[in-house]
């Protein structure tokens, strides 16, 4: 058993049928010695008396808010949560496996640049009685500071019969140098509590590996005289690290017909312009990627050919 | 400790081409190592990230773009002194700090070259003959060093009398390649910045 926060405790249980559970001793936070009784949640049934209460915690029915009283007055509370260990592996019931980039990916994180700011998100089908708390650091043995905000519900989607909820959090490394070569990964730890179930999820990454630039901005077409060709031009996104000559991007320009089956023409360039043939009803899209370290491509920025 | 925005002569930068070749070569070599050594801990998540140049060179700090010198987090560097004179510096106007940056890059390359050559000698003794260093990568390191053309003491190749532990050598190769790829990215950024300056 360990303390998650004041008066909230997590009991770790080896979870299998007929398991013996864990013996837990609760102590009433009071100078009083006599006349103390204990109850669980809203029940008025007295579970025991005295300054300490010994319980055998086996299932969720044994978890909850234990309260010690004296003469009708509440003295203190202890909330017990359960953390299930199933055959040596901590349960992952609360969050959905996003399966990207690999199986057992519960937290996904992205950064728009090298400033040390990043966003993480996760999915769940649970709509109520759910709380999250996020901590982060650079490295784990001698951790350096990363400050995270509060997790917020960022999207709701309908997936088949189920509703899916996306939560996200923004974090910022306290003293980040965009040019630094990372040798210690960022660690992100999410505590999730659903009713009386506690779970924790972690992700470890280098900022360089989670970079996903914003799409190029100011995408424009300039028709070339007496030609079906157009000059496409664009700019680096505002959110990208500067100077751009140091933090360079490479670009992919795509001409896509109306039909998804039509052949896509693609050009790769380090410049911020390209000359392409604009077909009728086609659209031109451009996306960006760090020129020197192949992390994710940005989303496409698009303009119609007409 | 930073790069001023110099205005060098047109087409001054032969090093840019070499640094791009270097990044391509080390990335290919790392990919090959990850595939060949699939039963070894060779992914970024599994290895310890060690920098053999730590406390010996300070490339990131010495080559910091001028725009980042206002960022205090970028200025916690160690002071290191370097020999200066190099053929990539095609302009007399190029500052002392730029020379310091390029000599730091040269020292990095020299240290990695020695490590890779020592490692290759060990890998050639492996009866499994599972993996060797790409000669193209070693050649590209050499080309960039020649383009930088700094006078520097030659570092003798390390020789070891004891029987090599091939498992450890292959893991060390992975560690070295990951670190060298990161340094090659920095070198490419620096060359791109200098070329644009």
């Amino acid at each position: 058993i360990w303390e998650l926060k004041k008066d909230v405790y997590v009991v770790e249980l080896d979870w299998y049928p007929d398991a013996p559970g864990e013996m837990v001793v609760l102590t009433c936070d009071t100078p009083e010695e006599d006349g103390i009784t204990w109850t669980l949640d809203q029940s008025s049934e007295v579970l025991g008396s005295g300054k300490t209460l010994t319980i055998q915690v086996k299932e969720f029915g044994d978890a909850g808010q234990y309260t010690c009283h004296k003469g009708g007055e509440v003295l203190s509370h202890s909330l017990l949560l359960l953390h299930k260990k199933e055959d040596g592996i901590w349960s992952t019931d609360i969050l959905k496996d996003q399966k990207e980039p690999k199986n057992k990916t519960f937290l996904r994180c992205e950064a728009k640049n090298y400033s040390g700011r990043f966003t993480c998100w996760w999915l769940t089908t649970i709509s109520t009685d759910l709380t999250f708390s996020v901590k982060s650091s650079r490295g784990s043995s001698d951790p350096q500071g990363v400050t995270c905000g509060a997790a917020t519900l960022s999207a709701e989607r309908v997936r088949g019969d189920n509703k899916e909820y996306e939560y996200s959090v923004e974090c910022q490394e306290d003293s980040a140098c965009p040019a630094a070569e990372e040798s210690l990964p960022i660690e992100v730890m999410v505590d999730a509590v659903h009713k009386l179930k506690y779970e924790n999820y972690t992700s470890s990454f280098f900022i360089r590996d989670i970079i996903k630039p914003d799409p190029p901005k100011n995408l424009q077409l300039k028709p070339l005289k007496n030609s079906r060709q157009v000059e496409v031009s664009w700019e680096y996104p505002d959110t990208w690290s500067t100077p751009h000559s140091y933090f360079s991007l490479t670009f992919c320009v795509q001409v896509q017909g109306k039909s998804k089956r039509e052949k896509k023409d693609r050009v790769f360039t380090d410049k911020t312009s390209a000359t392409v043939i604009c077909r009728k009803n086609a659209s031109i899209s451009v996306r960006a990627q760090d020129r020197y370290y192949s992390s994710s491509w940005s989303e496409w920025a698009s303009v119609p050919c007409s | 400790r930073n790069l001023p925005v110099a205005t060098p002569d047109p087409g001054m930068f032969p090093c840019l081409h070499h640094s791009q070749n270097l990044l391509r070569a080390v990335s290919n070599m790392l990919q090959k190592a990850r595939q060949t050594l699939e039963f070894y801990p060779c992914t970024s998540e599994e290895i310890d990230h060690e920098d053999i140049t730590k406390d010996k060179t300070s490339t990131v700090e010495a080559c910091l773009p001028l725009e980042l010198t206002k960022n205090e987090s970028c200025l916690n560097s160690r002071e290191t002194s370097f020999i200066t004179n190099g053929s990539c510096l095609a302009s007399r106007k190029t500052s002392f700090m730029m020379a310091l940056c390029l000599s730091s890059i040269y020292e990095d390359l020299k240290m990695y070259q020695v490590e890779f050559k020592t490692m290759n000698a060990k890998l050639l003794m492996d009866p499994k003959r599972q993996i060797f260093l790409d000669q193209n990568m070693l050649a590209v390191i050499d080309e960039l060093m020649q383009a930088l053309n700094f006078n520097s003491e030659t570092v003798p190749q390390k020789s070891s009398l004891e029987e090599p532990d091939f498992y450890k050598t292959k893991i060390k190769l992975c560690i070295l390649l990951h670190a060298f790829r990161i340094r090659a990215v920095t070198i490419d950024r620096v060359m791109s910045y200098l070329n644009a300056s």
Partner: antibody, heavy 115, light 111 residues
Framework: QVQLVQSGGGVVQPGRSLRLSCAAS????????MHWVRQAPGKGLEWVAF????????YYADSVKGRFTISRDNSKNTLYLQMKSLRAEDTAVYYC????????WGQGTMVTVSS | SYVLTQPPSVSGTPGQRVTISCSGG????????VKWYQQLPGTAPKLLIY???QRPSGVPDRFSGSKSGTSASLAITGVQAEDEADYYC????????????FGTGTKVTVL
Amino acid sequence: QVQLVQSGGGVVQPGRSLRLSCAASGFTFSSYGMHWVRQAPGKGLEWVAFIRYDGSNKYYADSVKGRFTISRDNSKNTLYLQMKSLRAEDTAVYYCKTHGSHDNWGQGTMVTVSS
Amino acid sequence: SYVLTQPPSVSGTPGQRVTISCSGGRSNIGKNTVKWYQQLPGTAPKLLIYGNDQRPSGVPDRFSGSKSGTSASLAITGVQAEDEADYYCQSYDRGTHPALLFGTGTKVTVL
């Protein structure tokens, strides 16, 4: 006392269907994940499928994906394995088992796919 | 489809020490715990070892398990006639959990 009692096995022709049941008693069935494991005659153990305690997630071996469906009825304390498009290679003793560091197995039920 | 490899058979005379190996990889045994089962002819498997080296109550202390890196082993010190059976190791793979990964199985013969 934890008990898993299996039923539903038998002889079936290729291409036909069969449903196995596993009745649980002696524990809070709705709190635990459950597996199906099979063993072809003279062969080793092969995992078939898993279902979460609340039925929200199901996992299958590649060899049965799209043909077999694992399900549970927590009100009846029963686990099921619906087997469709049966093949000769599905011939095996099928076991249900609880998920956890200490597990309990059903007695097994023989499924023979033969024309 | 078996990722965990066991020797097909091992044998020993009564009182001898018999060991069965179970070889896996970094993503399964390297990352997860190992169980060992005993299966007597015509019966369901019986759990002998869980959590690499833990014995459930009722399992004789002549059975012991260990794990090192990407391999595990089961030792029977002082093998007895009633130990003649098939033995299976079991673990999980990081990417496919909760799918059970079983070893190929080992027939133990007491001479």
